[in-house]
Amino acid sequence: NFMYSKTVKRLSKLQEYQQYYPSLTCVMEGKDMEDWSCCPTPWTSFQSSCYFISTVMQSWTKSQNNCSVMGADLVVINTKEEQDFITQNLKINSAYFLGLSDPKGWRHWQWVDQTPYNKNVTFWHSGEPNSPDERCAIINFRSEEWGWNDVHCHVPQKSICKMKKIYI
């Protein structure tokens, strides 16, 4: 009876999400393997988040709006482990917008989800950021490693979206 009611709840939750995400990829987790955590297909998952790499070249503002329409934000990177996971799926000759910007050009960087900007957990390439006119951040491959660079927000780039996993 308990299992039946849990399944009914799950199905109704799945139907609810189906209007936003036609297909979900779910895995069982939790100590009793009773919880399902899902990401939209074909997003990838890491820890409690889902990631989508957009190859459409757009400005930073349009990229953020594009993520927003999908219920996500441009990616906020919180740890080196998270960055290492993300970069496995990136092309080394491309650049991708992050959810990090400095709209006033005062070097007051801010994450799109209001996560406090912690200078101790940043992965800027050497010598970056280097221009107050370059107010948006990308991740790219340079000098044999992935790192961040400040660029012009209006210049079209690829981008990475991030959203919380859906639990059902």
Epitope: T61, K62, G105, S131, D133, R135, H152, C153, H154, V155
Partner: antibody
Framework: EVQLVESGGGLVKPGGSLRLSCAAS????????MSWVRQAPGKGLEWVST????????YYPDSVKGRFTISRDNAKNSLYLQMNSLRAEDTAVYYC??????????????WGQGTTVTVSS | DIVLTQSPASLAVSPGQRATITCRAS??????????MHWYQQKPGQPPKLLIY???NLESGVPARFSGSGSGTDFTLTINPVEAEDTANYYC?????????FGGGTKVEIK
Amino acid sequence: EVQLVESGGGLVKPGGSLRLSCAASGFTFSSYGMSWVRQAPGKGLEWVSTISSGDSYTYYPDSVKGRFTISRDNAKNSLYLQMNSLRAEDTAVYYCARQLYYSYGYYFDYWGQGTTVTVSS
Amino acid sequence: DIVLTQSPASLAVSPGQRATITCRASESVSFHGTHLMHWYQQKPGQPPKLLIYAASNLESGVPARFSGSGSGTDFTLTINPVEAEDTANYYCQQSIEDPPTFGGGTKVEIK
């Protein structure tokens, strides 16, 4: 006082080349992105190319891509536009303009007086 | 590319009256309260001159009779009251994404 002075315009045959220059003074040239904007006779404004302050970024519309090259010499406070394979439709007054960044975009806060390019056989 | 459509193409206004020019973008040029639309004035034989930046900010030295408003896709430049020296072409320009684009212009004549 900010000043932008263009030169190098003239009459050229189709397929020919010209190099426009823009001499900047009255501001720290190396700190600003710069653009070329043109205006065909009796027509509106059309952006032609942009170069970032540090020379790391250049951008062109499809109409001139591969034919025009923007460059700058910060030591000489000068902006250039090399125009090759010129066509009749490139006939216009060419303005150099300074970019001032605002939030996620920019605007053109100072313009030169322009130099006239005529492409005709 | 973002297309900017200005209207009207031309208008004649009596001195002391109000002139209103609109600029419609093919997609939003606003983001979180910042509106990346700018206005320029161009008098015959002269280069363009910046009037208004970011939809509503008056450039230094520009008379207060010029004002701008709008957000998203719809923007307005207002001259009130119009003076004889305002005879010119007026252009809007967006910069939220490359390439930067200009409207087709509006010719303002003083009756």
